[in-house]
């Protein structure tokens, strides 16, 4: 439905508070280096303009598109060329090319300082002094570091952030109340950001059809009692929402997400029995709750899939007449019967089915040709099952830290060209699959593990895309979205890799390691492990374990010493010499 003024329409729909928050997120996600104050100024100007359009939709410039209005505003930033270099060239373009240009310059790994958490009293004072600025700053800092963060969900995080401070700054023990909440928000936020990044990568790199297929599979698992037509409607609407958010159209995205939540709650009887509690919550909580809702129970007595998709004489007729609808129905029917499968496995099965029909529906004997298609699914199902079983056994045997180390070694040997910080970050996250998923019963392990691994491997893909260094990573990342994990799993040691020159500086440690948190100390050790493997890719597990054990003992010893720095200097030299000897460097 056309509106005379798009900006007025969105302002009225969303309300001033959400409007301002979303514009701030949008601007911070585009101009990630700009100071907070500059963004606030731009947002205030846009908001004032929007109010004039609400008052009179025919006022000057009110008929302009949001991209035009926002792009024009961003292009007024004085330091654009100095701060962003070639991104400034976007401003010479017309819409829609200008917005596309801004999108292409979003940086998944911006050169920004790590967010250091101030003392609790300092934070509480800042919160009380100026609550609005304090919360805006949160939105700004998260948005600029996570340029694809799902904007309406970030509003939900901000609401929880505010609630945490409101409650805990009045508590007797502020820190005990606040810090766990902030840790939880941080961890959930990182996970949310990574999940959304995969959705955007799916849309941008593989197209709408790939995203829709993912959505059909996931929603069919979640709402197995819903009819195919209902699931299709939800998929269409959800695709629109995510296309908008991934495209920087955050006002439209938030508005459409609210409409979708409203529709789902109005039609919950025909969607899922699990929505009741979600639908009683306020908007932001409601949308979040729906997105995380547990799978509904499968309808009883679902017939065999073979009847419609193998045995029917109309398989090829139905497929040829509406390929995507027929494949969508197959995916829906398979997914609603298999909440125990990962979405990516379901998509692999659908792809196999599609490939078989493409072949067999042009064959002289189509039925004989596709009669055994379901037999082809068996190895596809068994591969992730076996992999998860093996890795969960390894996780249970080693614990998270050592399991991460095993993965660090494995992945460094596969793709040693990748930067050490990226290998550490990705392998640590891959390793978290153990504590996240191995505790689940068999029926929940695969959807938990493999779909989580898809999210983590996407992080590797987007970081690698920024600075490509490995053809193998590029190949696994670009050939097939659903086969990324099997592609990486299948990689063996890269025999073409020329070992890195030994540099003693890489293995020189100082007393500051003693004051680091356990997590930071692990990262230091894991960084050293990656560097070791890069120097000696053919080192055995036993050799690496011996060196790492010596290293752990060395850190522990020197951190207990009276003169820590001297200990690190002297014992460090000995450790490096011993390690070189042990590894034959």
């Amino acid at each position: 439905d056309a509106h005379k003024s798009e900006v007025a329409h969105r302002f009225k729909d969303l309300g001033e508070e959400n409007f301002k928050a979303l514009v701030l997120i949008a601007f911070a996600q585009y101009l990630q280096q700009c100071p907070f104050e500059d963004h606030v100024k731009l947002v205030n100007e846009v908001t004032e303009f929007a109010k004039t359009c609400v008052a009179d939709e025919s006022a000057e410039n009110c008929d302009k598109s949001l991209h035009t209005l926002f792009g024009d505003k961003l292009c007024t930033v004085a330091t654009l060329r100095e701060t962003y270099g070639e991104m400034a060239d976007c401003c010479a373009k017309q819409e829609p090319e200008r917005n596309e240009c801004f999108l292409q310059h979003k940086d998944d790994n911006p050169n920004l300082p790590r967010l250091v958490r101030p003392e609790v009293d300092v934070m509480c004072t800042a919160f009380h002094d100026n609550e609005e600025t304090f919360l805006k700053k949160y939105l700004y800092e998260i948005a600029r570091r996570h340029p694809y963060f799902y904007a309406p969900e970030l509003l939900f995080f901000a609401k929880r952030y505010k609630a945490a401070f409101t409650e805990c700054c009045q508590a007797a023990d502020k820190a005990a109340c606040l810090l766990p909440k902030l840790d939880e928000l941080r961890d959930e936020g990182k996970a949310s950001s990574a999940k959304q990044r995969l959705k955007c990568a799916s849309l941008q790199k593989f197209g709408e059809r790939a995203f829709k297929a993912w959505a059909v599979a996931r929603l069919s698992q979640r709402f197995p009692k819903a009819e195919f037509a209902e699931v299709s409607k939800l998929v269409t609407d959800l695709t629109k929402v995510h296309t908008e958010c991934c495209h920087g159209d955050l006002l439209e995205c938030a508005d459409d997400r609210a409409d979708l939540a409203k529709y789902i709650c109005e039609n919950q009887d025909s969607i899922s029995s699990k929505l009741k509690e979600c639908c009683e919550k306020p908007l932001l909580e409601k949308s979040h709750c729906i997105a995380e809702v547990e799978n509904d129970e499968m309808p009883a007595d679902l017939p065999s899939l073979a009847a419609d998709f193998v045995e029917s004489k109309d398989v090829c007729k139905n497929y040829a007449e509406a390929k995507d609808v027929f494949l969508g129905m197959f995916l829906y029917e398979y997914a609603r019967r298999h909440p125990d499968y990962s979405v990516v496995l379901l998509l692999r099965l659908a792809k196999t089915y599609e490939t078989t029909l493409e072949k067999c529906c042009a064959a002289a004997d189509p039925h004989e040709c596709y009669a055994k298609v379901f037999d082809e699914f068996k190895p596809l199902v068994e591969e992730p099952q076996n992999l998860i079983k093996q890795n969960c056994e390894l996780f249970e045997q080693l614990g998270e830290y050592k399991f991460q180390n095993a993965l660090l070694v494995r992945y460094t040997k596969k793709v040693p060209q990748v930067s050490t910080p990226t290998l550490v970050e990705v392998s640590r996250n891959l390793g978290k699959v153990g504590s996240k998923c191995c505790k689940h019963p068999e029926a929940k392990r695969m959807p938990c593990a493999e779909d989580y691994l898809s999210v983590v491997l996407n992080q590797l893909c987007v970081l690698h895309e920024k600075t490509p260094v490995s053809d193998r990573v590029t190949k696994c990342c670009t050939e097939s979205l659903v086969n990324r994990r099997p592609c990486f799993s299948a990689l063996e040691v890269d025999e073409t890799y020329v070992p890195k020159e030994f540099n003693a500086e890489t293995f020189t440690f100082h007393a500051d390691i003693c004051t680091l948190s356990e997590k930071e100390r692990q990262i230091k050790k894991q960084t050293a492990l990656v560097e070791l493997v890069k120097h000696k890719p053919k080192a055995t597990k036993e050799q690496l374990k011996a060196v790492m054990d010596d290293f752990a003992a060395f850190v522990e010893k020197c951190c207990k010493a009276d003169d820590k720095e001297t200990c690190f200097a002297e014992e460090g030299k000995k450790l490096v010499a011993a390690s070189q000897a042990a590894l034959g460097l």
């Epitope: 004489k313 090829c316 040829a320 493409e358 072949k359 042009a362 064959a363 002289a364 189509p366 004989e368």
Partner: antibody
Amino acid sequence: QVQLQQSGAELVRPGSSVKISCKASGYAFSNYWMNWVKQRPGQGLEWIGQIYPGDGDTYYNGRFKGKATITADKSPTTAYMQLSSLTSEDSAVYVCARGVILGSFDYWGQGTTLTVSS
Amino acid sequence: QIVLTQSPAIMSASPGEKVTMTCSASSSVSYMHWYQQKSGTSPKRWIYDTSKLASGVPVRFSGSGSGTSYSLTIRSMEAEDAATYYCQQWGSNPLTFGAGTKLELK
């Protein structure tokens, strides 16, 4: 653009064998059935069989089992048909044709004339 | 195997005249395709999946039918339509062709 280029005319002795080729270009050769069709002078069309180069699967018209052997090579994107124990009845034009969904043949080669004569 | 009987075997039509030829199957088929062949050349796909016109085929041509009875119709004959037309069934192995209808210009 899609092209199917067949090998030249053949004149062979009865009892011998011949292998004719069909070089495909302009499309994903592995993903389409290649069919072979026989046409005798002044007569209709007769389907011999087909191959799916992606995995080598074949279907034959029962009348040509033992007479025709269809193969394909993915690297020069070429399909072949070998005809054995040739008689004058095998003298005909043989045409390769790409098969598509629901079994129609959308592109045809120019035909290879086979003459079996002593 | 399914036998396809085309009729008439030969027919002639004047320019502007409506032309209909039929293809009867010995048992039900899923889809029928039609090919045009002019002397000295390979056949060309003309109508496929019973009723769809192949690329470049004039809209005066149409195809219809189901089960065992199919037809090709030319709304208004033109000189360039003179050729032999073959039907071909899909859905039963082996694939089979009709003997052809030769359409001549009167």
